[in-house]
């Protein structure tokens, strides 16, 4: 067991042109905070994979208000270290993800708004107990300077925090087979770890995975009271006078509480008081909880079925991610039907419907012709969600309210002259052509019989609709 520690030294605009002046948006002042996530191994993990080695959130930093004329300084940062306790062995190789978050303090709907400003991901090798490692990383136009280290928490020592130490029983040397616990020369390596479940009160071991019983106890895990009080044949820490095993260590000897938990004895057992961020009988369960406020953008923190289980965030519509940190383009889901236009207003989704459709998602197909009278004898034709008028001759437009000039499109071919008529139009064809639109040439032996103009109309007369 141990703790990974991260110290942020500075976060600010990187060198070069185009560097941002301020982390805040135009909406007003903001402040920064950081999230660190540790994943085991050096393999490229999926972005959404859990922070299996642990995660931590910093406190919020001081409020930053941009001074337009002043040079952009290093930004005010939260105080203190970010600490990520780890329960098991330190893996040595790990992925370090540091996120810089911005909390906008302007007049936001629903309170402060959070957005991810920068994320750096590094794959690193690091031995526990070593010195601070320093690093500078760029994330877009931002630059982050930080140091980090992994340290073991007693009784664990070593580069992986797997060796256990405890105070020497004698001042001069360690017990048989146990080496001094460097660098703690006044401590010794602890006895090996017994078989899982071996009774803390009634069992002991000389080799890893063993479980040997003190007098009066039996069974594979030394949890069954023995009917005999004979000491013969038993070996182990013994009294020189009787040859029998003496009572073993108290339930708190060797501190069964992991991750810096403190042990207190209770009748026949023990109780661990765990540091913040750890839970469980032996403080073996680690992680951020709802008390740390991990859900952003109005997300609701929902604990697991019991206090030891991890939280989840239920995100408001429009946000997703394990901490509701990602804004969703809700219009990408195409919620508006029948060709409606989607508008994401932040606090709500709106659909602007095409003609002939209505409803919050344009799901209702209106009777296209209902209440849509076509003027001047036109008839309404439904289709495609928008009504259309089929107009009487001589009228046009959406509702047949516009007078139409049937000759405007020059329908008579080959120089024929067009005459508007109550029933449409008539073409007076040039010599040598015939047909309703003068489209056919007259055969050489044929004669054009069309009149120069229809009765009652002269070329050039204003249109008259009878």
């Amino acid at each position: 067991a141990g703790v990974f520690e991260l110290q942020i030294h500075s976060f600010g605009p990187g060198p070069g042109p185009g560097a941002p002046r301020s982390p805040c948006s135009a909406r007003g002042p903001c402040r920064l905070f950081f999230r660190v996530c540790l994943k085991p191994g050096l393999s490229e993990e999926a972005a959404e994979s859990p922070c299996a080695l642990g995660a931590a959130l910093s406190a919020r930093g001081p409020v930053y208000t941009e001074q337009p004329e002043a040079p952009a300084p290093d930004l005010p940062l939260p105080n203190g270290l970010l600490q990520v306790p780890f329960r098991d062995a330190w893996p040595g190789t790990f992925s370090l993800i540091i996120e810089t978050w911005r909390e906008e303090l302007g007049d936001q709907i629903g309170g402060p708004a959070w957005s991810l400003l920068a994320r750096v991901t590094r794959r690193r090798r690091l031995a526990a107990g070593g010195p601070w490692a320093r690093d500078i990383q760029r994330a877009g136009a931002w630059e982050l300077r930080f140091s980090y280290r992994a340290r073991c928490e007693l009784p664990a020592v070593g580069t992986a925090c797997t060796r256990l130490c405890r105070p020497r029983s004698a001042p001069s040397r360690c017990g048989p087979g146990l080496r001094p616990c460097a660098p703690l020369e006044d401590e010794c390596e602890a006895p090996p770890v017994c078989r899982a479940g071996c009774s803390l009160e009634h069992g002991f071991c000389e080799q890893p995975g063993e479980c040997r019983c003190l007098e009066g106890w039996t069974g594979p895990l030394c949890m069954v009271p023995a009917s005999t009080s004979s000491c013969l044949g038993l070996r182990g820490p013994s009294s020189a006078t009787t040859g029998c095993l003496v009572p073993g260590p108290g339930p708190c000897d060797g501190n069964p509480c992991a991750n810096g938990g403190s042990c207190s004895e209770t009748p026949g057992s023990f109780e661990c008081t765990c540091p913040r961020g750890f839970y469980g009988l032996r403080c073996e369960v680690s992680g951020v909880t709802c008390a740390d406020g991990p859900c952003f953008n109005g997300g609701l923190c929902v604990g697991g079925a019991d206090p030891d289980s991890a939280y989840i965030c239920h995100c408001p519509p429009g946000f997703q991610g394990s901490n509701c940190e990602k804004r969703v383009d809700r219009c990408s889901l195409q919620p508006c039907r029948n060709g409606g236009l989607c508008l994401d207003l932040g606090h709500a989704l709106r659909c602007r419907c095409r003609a002939g459709f209505a409803g919050p998602r344009c799901e209702h197909n209106l009777d296209d012709c209902a209440g849509r009278a076509c003027a001047n004898g036109g008839t309404c034709v439904e289709g495609g969600g928008a009504h259309r008028c089929s107009c009487a001759l001589g009228f046009g437009g959406r509702d047949c309210r516009e007078r139409a000039d049937p000759c405007a499109a020059r329908p008579c071919a080959h120089g024929g002259r067009c005459y508007a008529h109550f029933s449409g139009l008539v073409c007076a064809c040039a010599p040598g052509y015939m047909g309703s639109r003068c489209e056919f040439p007259v055969h050489p032996d044929g004669v054009s019989a069309l009149p120069a103009a229809p009765p009652g109309l002269r070329p050039g007369d204003p249109q008259r609709y009878l």
């Epitope: 629903g110 709802c290 406020g293 859900c295 109005g298 609701l300 604990g303 606090h347 709500a348």
Partner: antibody, heavy 118, light 108 residues
């Protein structure tokens, strides 16, 4: 503007299941979380649980073993079922929409009184 | 769960007066995820304030909210006759969602 209307029997016998429906108008049920809250006569408000259109639910632990909230997007309705009722479940039951900027309640139905009595 | 305690339970005041209602949480309410509601007799509650200090749509500016952490207040700068009702606070930081016991504002 979203409007909500509770419906269901006003009298339920002890040990039976209370069933209420909330009909949503003026908005799509697919846009919000939807919740039930109750208020015993002369007392304060108690959150029962909520449902999202996708089916995600979350219930008050004090009622979890007896509560089911479900949603019917085709009818723009969501419903509450509370089993094994006793006189202590007598209350005005409200349906409400949860805001899009956080889990508070921006629109409420007018409430319906459910009495548990034999 | 977060327990919200409202005080006082009942308050007798006259129209025109200024009033401050208190809501105290048993644990820190992160991100100021706290709302206030007004409930008039025989009516459903109505949202007044969310995010501890943001007024809901259509709420008069005589209503204001403040506070953070575990202590929150609702202030009505000048009481109108229609303001005499019961006021509830609600946290939405973590599940289960919880309400305060309410403060009843009655006419003196």
């Amino acid at each position: 503007q979203v409007q909500l209307q509770e419906s269901g029997p006003g009298l339920v016998k002890p040990s039976e299941t209370l069933s209420l429906t909330c009909t949503v108008s003026g908005g799509s049920i697919s846009s919000y979380y939807w919740s039930w809250i109750r208020q015993p006569p002369g007392k304060g408000l108690e959150w029962i649980g909520y449902v999202y259109y996708s089916g995600t639910t979350n219930y008050n632990p004090s009622l979890k073993s007896r509560v089911t909230i479900s949603v019917d997007t085709s009818k723009n309705q969501f419903s509450l079922k509370l089993s094994s009722v006793t006189a202590a479940d007598t209350a005005v039951y409200y349906c409400a929409s949860i805001a899009v900027t956080g889990f508070y309640f921006d629109y409420w139905g007018q409430g319906t009184l459910v009495t548990v009595s034999s | 769960e977060i327990v919200l305690t409202q005080s006082p339970g009942t308050l007798s005041l006259s129209p025109g007066e200024r009033v401050t209602l208190s809501c105290r949480a048993s644990q820190r309410v992160n991100n100021n995820y706290l709302a206030w509601y007004q409930q008039r007799p025989g009516q459903a509650p109505r949202l007044l304030i969310y995010g501890a200090s943001s007024r809901a749509t259509g709420i008069p500016d005589r209503f204001s909210g403040s506070g953070s952490g575990t202590d929150f207040t609702l202030t009505i700068s000048r009481l109108e006759p229609e303001d005499f009702a019961v006021y509830y606070c609600q946290q939405y930081d973590r599940s289960p969602l919880t309400f305060g016991g309410g403060t009843k504002l009655e006419i003196k």
